[in-house]
């Protein structure tokens, strides 16, 4: 807290600008009028304050504002966000996408910070949705920021604004975030091509169901290893052999080199050693011939 | 954390030159903006003159034309403080200071270098 002091002579400040850099802080306190600072925002940014002197400016707006700054104050910002709380960020109605683009570039390069999800929580909460130009933004600066919400949260995402992701957002989502992603993005690309379709949905194939799978063995879409091997275990284990085959195309071959991984690994225990051997890749663990597969879970359901 | 660390400082008769350096190691990546400080004995500590991340510079008005400031954003960051046409009144403890970008944003200081201004 900065005390009260009067201003010396000659020192009120007309407008910001850099010779309030040598201000001291009871000076900038004293000499600095609250609603000149804040019609002048935009040049505090260009402005090379000490995070002290930007500390005065804060307590300056605050007093103005205390229920929130407005905002056009918001926008402007700049450096002085650094300076803000969670708390002072819970009391702000952020609902242009340029304020926020202009808060994040002040965080750029950095780990996202409790600041940073607090704005982005209003901010989508203030729109209602996870719209498409909001998505573009938000993974452009932060590429994982997808696989950060919850499947509750990622419910909220119009299948429309699907168009805006980019595989490097999905690199660390689970399993359950890839359940909720793929019928969305099935839904986007649903008017595309084979080959168009495939390149787009790709990367949210780990929530797809084996029927999809299924569906684009029949395709000649020469899935590639690591996509093949981020795939749901439980869709993948009732392919069969000459479905993998279809599927993967000339990439067939790599299921040697992940035979002991999931989900090949389960895949094979399910398979014939017979139909393995058609492969010729010399893959072992299938199930010997002569021999009888009883599906106990069947069974139960009958009886 | 960023570690600042002064020379240069010395002994010179007034209207001499010296040239203060500071070095910069650890996170310099880090770094924002850049100034040197002076503290007379019984006096506040003044901005000299500051360096912002874009190279542009600013002067205190005692010190605008004899002073210049500059920095390098090589491997290892360097301020300098290029004094010339020294006065006695400039004799002070000269301090090194950087920001860095991020939150909360952290100020690092160095220990200072000793200019002494003889008439």
């Known amino acids: 807290e900065v005390e009260k002091t009067a201003c010396p002579s000659g020192k009120k400040a007309r407008e910001i600008d850099e010779s309030l850099i040598f201000y001291k802080k009871w000076e900038l306190e004293a000499c600095v009028d609250a609603a000149l600072l804040a019609t002048q925002m935009d040049r505090v940014n260009a402005i090379p304050f000490t995070y002290e002197q930007l500390d005065v400016l804060k307590h300056k707006l605050d007093e103005l504002y205390p229920q929130g700054y407005p905002e056009s104050v918001i926008q402007h910002l700049g450096y002085l966000f650094l300076k803000m709380s969670p708390e002072d960020i819970r009391k702000w109605n952020v609902t242009s996408l340029e304020t926020l683009k202009a808060l994040l570039e002040v965080n750029k390069g950095h780990e996202m910070s409790p600041q940073v999800a607090t704005l982005i929580d209003r901010f989508v909460k203030g729109r209602g949705q996870l719209d498409k130009d909001t998505l573009d933004t938000l993974t452009a600066f932060y590429p994982g920021y997808l696989c950060s919400l919850s499947p509750e949260e990622l419910s909220s995402v119009p299948p429309s604004s699907i168009w805006a992701v980019r595989p490097q957002d999905l690199d660390t989502c689970d399993p359950r975030q890839l359940d909720v992603l793929y019928p969305k993005a099935r839904l986007a690309f649903q008017n595309m091509n084979g080959s168009e379709y495939f390149v787009k949905i790709q990367s949210f194939l780990g929530g797809a169901p084996t029927e999809d799978l299924k569906a684009l063995s029949q395709q000649n879409v020469s899935m590639d290893l690591a996509t093949f091997m981020k795939l749901r275990t439980d869709a993948v284990l009732p392919l069969t052999v000459a479905e993998v085959q279809k599927l993967l195309g000339p990439h067939v071959e790599g299921l040697k080199a992940e035979e002991r991984h999931r989900p090949v690994r389960d895949w094979i225990l399910r398979q014939r050693q017979d139909d393995l051997d058609t492969l010729g890749l010399g893959l072992q663990g299938g199930i010997p011939n002569g021999y009888l597969v009883l599906d106990l879970s069947m069974q139960e359901a009958l009886s | 954390q960023v570690q600042l660390v002064e020379s240069g400082g010395g002994l010179v008769q007034a209207g001499g030159s010296l040239r203060l350096s500071c070095a910069a190691s650890?996170?310099?990546?880090?770094?924002?903006?850049m100034r040197w400080y002076r503290q007379a004995p019984g006096k506040q500590r003044e901005l000299v003159a500051t360096?912002?991340?874009?190279?542009?510079?600013?002067y205190l008005g005692s010190v605008k034309g004899r002073f210049t400031i500059s920095r390098t954003n090589a491997k290892n960051t360097l301020l300098y403080l290029q004094m010339n046409s020294l006065k006695p009144e400039d004799s002070a403890l000269y301090i090194c200071n950087a920001d860095t970008w991020g939150w909360p944003g952290a100020d690092y200081w160095g220990q200072g270098t000793q200019v002494t201004v003889s008439s």
């Open positions: 650890g996170s310099i990546s880090s770094i924002r903006h």
């Open positions: 360096v912002s991340n874009d190279g542009s510079a600013y």
